[in-house]
């Protein structure tokens, strides 16, 4: 339940202006996340680790158009939605649709944005209005983060700005892509 509070329950999908799509609600139960049907691993799993660098998480690719009022980007943009539980990289299957998804029963790890990127988009407007250029912020990569609870367990600690910067010397994480990038017009956010 802490995670729901952390995400602020912002999961309703309505067409809106701006930069960011909300993760679609169906991602929470999406089969492509490969979560274990039985609810996770048995106790004393041989791969149990406390080192966050050993964990990896799903990066789901979504393609969408950026809108600003009546204007829409000439081309869609592709970005990531960080979704699902984190598991040891060794157990993470290379392709969505194979294997079981590992769910830790101990520390609370979550898949969160690691880095953002800025992309300039050209917005085409109806009625002969001049095109608009906008620079949008897109999720570029995801990472696993160990979330520590406050005393009241109602909030989760922040990531800090360092969570959004690439870390030198970190092992590359395997990225799970669907065979074809998901095409969707998700809710935009600024």
């Amino acid at each position: 339940q802490g995670w729901q509070a952390f995400k602020n329950d912002a999961t309703e999908i309505i067409p809106e202006l701006g930069e960011y799509p909300e993760p679609p609600p169906e991602l929470e139960n999406n089969k492509t996340m490969n979560r274990a049907e039985n609810g996770g691993r048995p106790p004393h799993h041989p791969f149990e680790t406390k080192d966050v660098s050993e964990y990896s998480c799903r990066e789901l690719h979504f393609t969408r158009y950026v809108t600003d009022g009546p204007c829409r980007s000439a081309k869609p943009v592709t970005e990531l939605v960080c979704s699902g539980q984190c598991g040891p990289a060794r157990l993470l299957p290379n392709a969505i649709g194979r294997g079981k998804w590992w769910r830790p029963s101990g520390p609370d790890f979550r898949c969160i944005p690691d880095r953002y990127r800025a992309q300039r988009v050209q917005l085409l407007c109806p009625g002969g209005e001049a095109p608009r250029a906008r620079k949008v912020r897109l999720v570029a990569s995801c990472k696993c983060k160990r979330l520590t609870r406050f005393h009241n367990q109602s909030e989760l600690k922040d990531f800090g700005t360092e969570a959004a910067r690439p870390q030198k010397g970190r092992k590359p994480r395997p990225r799970a892509r669907s065979a074809k990038a998901n095409q969707a017009e998700l809710e935009n956010a600024y």
Epitope: A10, E19, A118, K135
Partner: antibody, heavy 116, light 111 residues
């Protein structure tokens, strides 16, 4: 019409706590990144913290570990919980809407004074 | 992250043009990220005047314009008017895109 209205400022002793609120209206609150920016008396603007539309939070080094930004999308309200306050935290605190990597709307500000 | 340097003050007479510079310095001194400019009158909240280097929000006079060359951005105000007297701040986002930095501010005096 977009409106941001801050409240909760006041006088607090060093080491004390204060919670600021920013009530938003006139736009789809849950779709926006939102920031707190402060301005010490007679000084320039300093970015404090941001929350993404999904609730991910980031902080300036000067407040990390002491301040917590949060949002309640059901109430269209942004918060800043400030703990372990110091004299140098004395400032007018503004909430600002973060759109396309800039702040397009600002609140009127609320004054926080940290003094014994 | 980047730091932004502005002149402390500039002045001009009504009708004149003035330019305020904003120079970025960082570990990798190259192109600074897209800059926005804010106007702040005493006791008031800042107001967005220019974003993405040279774009004006609706409602902002076309006397205000922005430009960028290398690691320096500039705000130009033409046809200076008394109501332009205010503090002006440049701002940009950090490399992570999750933080912001402001210049120290420039006090514009209309003589």
């Amino acid at each position: 019409q977009v409106q941001l209205v801050e409240s909760g400022g006041g006088l607090v002793q060093p080491g004390g706590s204060l919670r600021l609120s920013c009530a938003a209206s006139g736009f789809t609150f849950r779709s926006h990144w939102l920031s707190w920016v402060r301005q010490a008396p007679g000084k320039g603007l300093e970015w404090v913290s941001v929350t993404t539309h999904q609730g991910y939070t980031y902080y300036a080094d000067s407040v990390k570990g002491r301040f917590t930004i949060s949002r309640d999308n059901s109430k269209n309200t942004l918060y800043l919980q400030m703990n372990s306050l110091r004299a140098e935290d004395t400032a007018v605190y503004y909430c600002a809407r973060d759109t396309y990597l800039h702040f397009d709307y600002w609140g009127q500000g609320t004054l926080v004074t940290v003094s014994s | 992250d980047i730091a932004l340097t502005q002149p402390a003050s500039v002045s001009g007479s009504p009708g004149q043009s003035i330019t305020i510079s904003c120079t970025g310095t960082s570990s990798d001194v190259g192109d600074i990220n897209d800059v926005s400019w804010y106007q702040q009158h005493p006791g008031k909240a800042p107001k967005l005047m220019i974003y993405d280097v040279n774009n004006r929000p609706s409602g902002v006079s076309n006397r205000f314009s922005g430009s960028k060359s290398g690691n320096t951005a500039s705000l130009t105000i033409s046809g200076l008017q008394a109501e332009d007297e205010a503090d002006y701040y440049c701002s940009s986002y950090g490399e992570s895109l999750t933080s912001y930095v402001f210049g120290g501010g420039t006090k514009l005096t209309v003589l």
